[in-house]
């Protein structure tokens, strides 16, 4: 968590920001809330980015005003603008690229003040990974796939019965690149698994932890999967 | 209600040029993007391009390049698609349709009536 | 630029019945895939939106999945006015780009 104040003729503001990533391909957004004022017209938004010329997005007096905005954001960016009156400045990003990670300024102006706060943001892909019985390996065998991950993760097993064992002799994990080149599908295969135990598939890398787990039993398979982004502070 | 009503049907001669107009109201002009598509008799949608009322910002399908203008004008609400040097093969219905999202640029969610344009010699 | 391969190009299916409509991009991955229905000399009415988002006032029946390359439109059980054209909308990248179109018709 981040938090900013003003520090210019008029009174500061609190803005606080939180880190987040972005999953390439689909929607991110960049959270910012600040103290709210009761007249809209009287709120300015800034989105900006380091190392980028243009604004990021740009909304002041109820609306969207876009003429500064730079053309790696065109058609791409909204806040959400029916809760800005009540202190939300957040951004919407559309189809997140790798390039969009950086560090952005969520700056603020009311009639109460001026704010701002940085944001971390974080590029790359990461999805649930599901936890199935391999029938037709010769012996019993697990296998964990998940669709997108991005830097290549690391992926270790563990289980309920064998707590604090290494798998990583009985397991085997492959990387299969994309059709898109850039993200990764993760599969992971562990043998030589018991009965009446729950084993778990956990894939991490720098923007986030997922795990599925999975229990055998002689009657039944049950199945759960979760995922955790690793960087949200605020500031 | 979000409402997109286009100009009437036009009937052209090859190599002359034609202007559809889309009024819109019922929404914030200025706040959303505005595309073009159009259909050939039987044929399937094809995207002419956008613009961002807001700020004038256009993209247009590489095919059409050089040949479509996509301009607005925020006095009236309106957007126009101006199609030149046509021909036979320009013949088709042509749509307008706001694109959700505000800023961002959205599928299109609300259409108009479409407008036929003919080219005929 | 992306293209958007649509199949099949019309299919016969009576009411009732489960269909299914699959849209290839060319190449990327993004789920901004929308789908929609058009009938004859109506305008196109957008269905689903972001793979999977509902429009609102689209009934259930109605649903889309998909990821990486691969996009699908499934109807669990045709009604009547169903039968309409089908059309896959690719609109993540700057170019847009439509399916070819499925014509979903009576048997």
């Known amino acids: 968590l981040i938090i900013g104040f003003g520090i210019s003729g008029r009174h500061s503001i609190t803005v606080t920001t939180v880190a987040s990533a972005g999953n390439i391909g689909e929607d991110g957004i960049l959270s910012c809330t600040f103290e709210p004022d009761i007249k809209l017209s009287d709120i300015v938004i800034q989105w900006l980015k380091e190392g980028v010329l243009g604004l990021v997005h740009e909304f002041k007096e109820g609306k969207d005003e876009l003429s500064e905005q730079d053309e790696m954001f065109r058609g791409r960016t909204a806040v959400f603008a029916d809760q800005v009156i009540v202190g939300n400045a957040s951004l919407r990003l559309k189809n997140v690229q790798l390039t969009d990670a950086g560090t952005y300024k969520c700056y603020i102006i009311t009639s109460k003040g001026k704010g701002n706060a940085n944001l971390e943001y974080k590029t790359g892909a990461f999805s649930m990974p599901e936890v199935n019985v391999d029938y037709n390996a010769s012996s019993e065998t697990l296998r964990c796939e998940a669709p997108r991950w991005f830097p290549q993760p690391t992926v270790v097993w563990a289980s309920q019965v064998d707590q604090g064992a290494n798998f990583s002799e009985v397991s085997n994990t492959s990387f299969e690149l994309n059709s898109e080149n850039v993200t990764m599908k993760v599969v992971s295969v562990l043998y030589n698994v018991t009965i009446n135990n729950t084993y778990s598939c956990m894939i991490e890398n720098d923007i986030a932890k997922a795990t599925g787990d999975i229990k055998v039993t002689e009657s039944e398979i049950k199945r759960r999967s979760h995922l955790q982004l690793l960087n949200s502070k605020a500031s | 209600e979000v409402q997109l009503v286009q100009s009437g049907a036009e009937v052209k001669k090859p190599g002359a040029s034609v202007k559809v107009s889309c009024k819109a109201s019922g929404y914030t002009f200025t706040s959303y993007w505005i595309g073009w598509v159009r259909q050939a008799p039987g044929q399937g949608l094809e995207w002419i391009g956008d613009?961002?009322?807001?700020?004038?910002?256009?993209n247009y399908n590489e095919k059409f390049k050089g040949r479509a203008t996509i301009t607005a004008d925020t006095s009236t609400s309106t957007a126009y698609l101006e199609l030149s040097s046509l021909r036979s093969e320009d013949t088709a219905v042509y749509y307008c349709?706001?694109?959700?999202?505000?800023?961002?640029?959205?599928?299109?969610?609300?259409w108009g009536q479409g407008t036929l344009v003919t080219v005929s010699s | 630029d992306i293209q958007m391969t649509q199949s099949p190009s019309s299919l016969s299916a009576s009411v009732g019945d489960r269909v299914t409509i699959t849209c290839k991009a060319s190449?990327?991955?993004?789920?901004?895939v929308a789908w929609y229905q058009q009938k004859p000399g109506k305008a196109p009415k957008l269905l689903i939106h972001y793979t999977s988002t509902l429009q609102p006032g689209v009934p259930s029946r109605f649903s889309g999945s998909g990821s990486g390359r691969d996009y699908t439109l499934t109807i669990s059980s045709l009604q009547p006015e169903d039968f309409a054209t089908y059309y896959c909308?690719?609109?993540?990248?700057?170019?847009?780009?439509f399916g070819q179109g499925t014509k979903v018709e009576i048997k």
């Open positions: 190449q990327g991955f993004n789920k901004y």
């Open positions: 349709a706001r694109l959700d999202g505000s800023s961002y640029r959205g599928a299109m969610d609300s």
């Open positions: 909308l690719q609109y993540g990248n700057l170019l847009y780009a």
């Open positions: 613009i961002y009322p807001g700020g004038g910002y256009t």
